[in-house]
């Protein structure tokens, strides 16, 4: 007995052959014995079978002795054995139908499961083997679990069922719900205008939902929320905005906010969480602020950073095309009775520069100027 | 020529059975369907059921599920048609018919009356 | 099951007039460009005789003054000119699916 694997939804064609090369009397039945087609000249007539409206063939093959039985919009309950009698023989074509959804939905958040469920027919032992966008294997029966979804894993999921030695393919799109980036660190002067961009990494027709920017400055003892917003259709409206910082919105996507001004007090690091309409859980992402501030007092010139800033960067003060006077990984560095001139206060990662600030020392007799 | 040649008529007691016989000539048996109908006494016409000569498969209308049995035996081309636990609604006129080239029933036997009476 | 409903029941024509006979189908009885209706005449103690098939072709030997038209589930049988041999009652019946059902019948008189 022939077996044909069909997926759920497509259309199969089974087939039949005569030894003749002409038009002769065929007919498809089921295995209850229930006529699904048949022809009467060369014309088709169907039977009273549950495939009446989703059965046919191809009257232009029957010329040459060939009488498929094409069933379209598969359902897994179509899986049955098909017998084709032409001539004085029958043709026996087991078609066996499998389906393979995802759990409720395609779109799904950053860290949440995914399972993907076989149906299949009654009697039959599939095993499954599914391919991620990013090439990861995983293995299952009636059920496959990937907990933990990662951004890499948005994308088309091939899945193979294997049975009785035939393989039908199966591809799913999956939408993982995310911003591009998990964190991000905006370096600024004081007094600087910052801009925060919350791009995400996914685009969808329509896109509803509310979000907030938490805030825990360094300074502070507890966070605040800085802004309240609701998202309609892509259209971006405030709800509640606190008066200092008076953070200002676009009203188009990505996400982007404006802070007036760069203030040591607002240095610190936020929480942007976006809660999408209809879905469990919230999409989040990190962003930090660096404020650098050079400033020279009496004999004293000091640079300071304030923010969420790691051990390894170097905070250095130099005079202009000279030598570092003093580099430390520290939050702060000083020098005292500094020369006249134009001198600049890096912080920098294995000698690249995030963050300069200049500032002008002028003779003794004069007060400090800074550009 | 085609001809189809129908048993004579029966007249049984109601809870009998009956069988009755279509000898097909002027075609090879095999390659067309029979098809069975009745017509009740100035009543309309009805599909009871067709059978493939050549694998002896046979298709019925719900209707006469349990009622009619179709069989055909090629070595003699004859179709046959067996009728059980008769009541007096199966007195009819019943009919064996095949398909021309086309869609309708162009070949038709004369009919063999049943009449169901104690 | 494919209802077929002709009108009208009956009807009287003159001889050598028209006659025409509707058969409404509960559901289209066309597949791949074809009208799977046809039409009989039976005459009283007489099998059907098979006029036309698949909506409009006239079956061999049949004369020419018969002939059908219609798609989908509106088909009509018309006669003409009427002769005098052309009193019988008239079915239509579909052959789309199983069961292939019969209109209720027409019955012809000649005036």
């Known amino acids: 007995k022939k077996v044909v694997l069909g997926k759920k939804g497509d259309t199969v064609e089974l087939t039949c052959t005569a030894s003749q090369k002409k038009s002769i009397q065929f007919h498809w039945k089921n295995s209850n014995q229930i006529k699904i087609l048949g022809n009467q000249g060369s014309f088709l007539t169907k039977g009273p079978s549950k495939l009446n409206d989703r059965a046919d063939s191809r009257r232009s093959l029957w010329d040459q002795g060939n009488f498929p039985l094409i069933i379209k919009n598969l359902k897994i309950e179509d899986s049955d054995t098909y017998i084709c009698e032409v001539e004085d023989q029958k043709e026996e074509v087991q078609l066996l139908v499998f389906g393979l959804t995802a759990n409720s939905d395609t779109h799904l958040l950053q860290g949440q499961s995914l399972t993907l469920t076989l149906e299949s027919p009654p009697g039959s032992s599939p095993s499954v083997q599914c391919r991620s966008p990013r090439g990861k294997n995983i293995q299952g029966g009636k059920t496959l679990s990937v907990s933990q979804l990662e951004l890499q894993d948005s994308g088309t999921w091939t899945c193979t069922v294997l049975q009785n030695q035939k393989k039908v393919e199966f591809k799913i799109d999956i939408v993982v719900l995310a911003f591009q980036k998990a964190s991000s660190i905006v370096y600024k002067k004081e007094g600087e205008q910052v801009e925060f961009s919350f791009p995400l990494a996914f685009t969808v027709e329509k896109l509803t939902g509310s979000g907030e920017l938490w805030w825990q400055a360094e300074r502070a003892s507890s966070s605040k929320s800085w802004i309240t917003f609701d998202l309609k259709n892509k259209e971006v409206s405030v709800k509640r905005v606190t008066q200092d910082p008076k953070l200002q919105m676009g009203k188009k996507l990505p996400l982007h906010l404006t802070l007036p001004q760069a203030l040591p007090q607002y240095a610190g690091s936020g929480n942007l969480t976006l809660a999408l309409e209809a879905k469990t859980g919230k999409l989040h992402q990190e962003v930090n602020l660096v404020v650098m501030r050079a400033t020279q007092l009496q004999k004293n010139l000091t640079c300071e950073v304030w923010g969420p800033t790691s051990p390894k960067l170097m905070l250095s003060l130099k005079l202009e095309n000279k030598e570092a006077k003093v580099s430390k990984r520290e939050k702060a560095v000083w020098v005292l009775n500094p020369e006249a001139g134009m001198w600049q206060c890096l912080l920098s990662d294995s000698g690249q520069v995030l963050l300069e600030s200049n500032i002008k020392v002028l003779p003794t007799w004069s007060t400090p100027v800074q550009p | 020529q085609v001809q189809l040649q129908q048993s004579g008529p029966e007249l049984v007691k109601p809870g009998a059975s009956v069988k009755m016989s279509c000898k097909a000539s002027g075609y090879t048996f095999t390659d067309y369907v029979i098809n069975w109908l009745n017509q009740r006494t100035g009543q309309g016409l009805e599909w009871i059921g067709e059978i493939y000569p050549g694998s002896g498969s046979a298709y019925y209308n719900e209707m006469f599920k349990g009622k009619a049995t179709l069989t055909a035996d090629k070595s003699s081309n004859t179709a046959y048609m067996q009728l059980s636990s008769l009541t007096s609604e199966d007195s009819a006129v019943y009919f064996c018919?095949?398909?021309?080239?086309?869609?309708?029933?162009?070949?038709w036997g004369r009919g063999t009356l049943v009449t169901v009476s104690a | 099951d494919i209802v077929l409903t002709q009108s009208p029941a009956s009807l009287a024509v003159s001889l050598g007039q028209r006659a025409t006979i509707s058969c409404k189908a509960s559901?289209?009885?066309?597949?791949?460009?074809?009208?799977?209706m046809n039409w009989y005449q039976q005459k009283p103690g007489q099998p059907p005789k098979l006029l036309i098939y698949a909506a409009s072709n006239l079956e061999s030997g049949i004369p020419a003054r018969f002939s059908g038209s219609g798609s989908g589930t509106d088909f009509t049988l018309n006669i003409h000119p009427v002769e005098e041999e052309d009193a019988a009652t008239y079915y239509c019946q579909q052959s789309s699916e199983d069961p292939p059902t019969f209109g209720g019948g027409t019955k012809l008189e000649i005036k």
């Open positions: 018919a095949r398909r021309g080239t086309g869609t309708g029933f162009a070949y």
């Open positions: 559901q289209s009885v066309d597949y791949d460009g074809d009208s799977y």
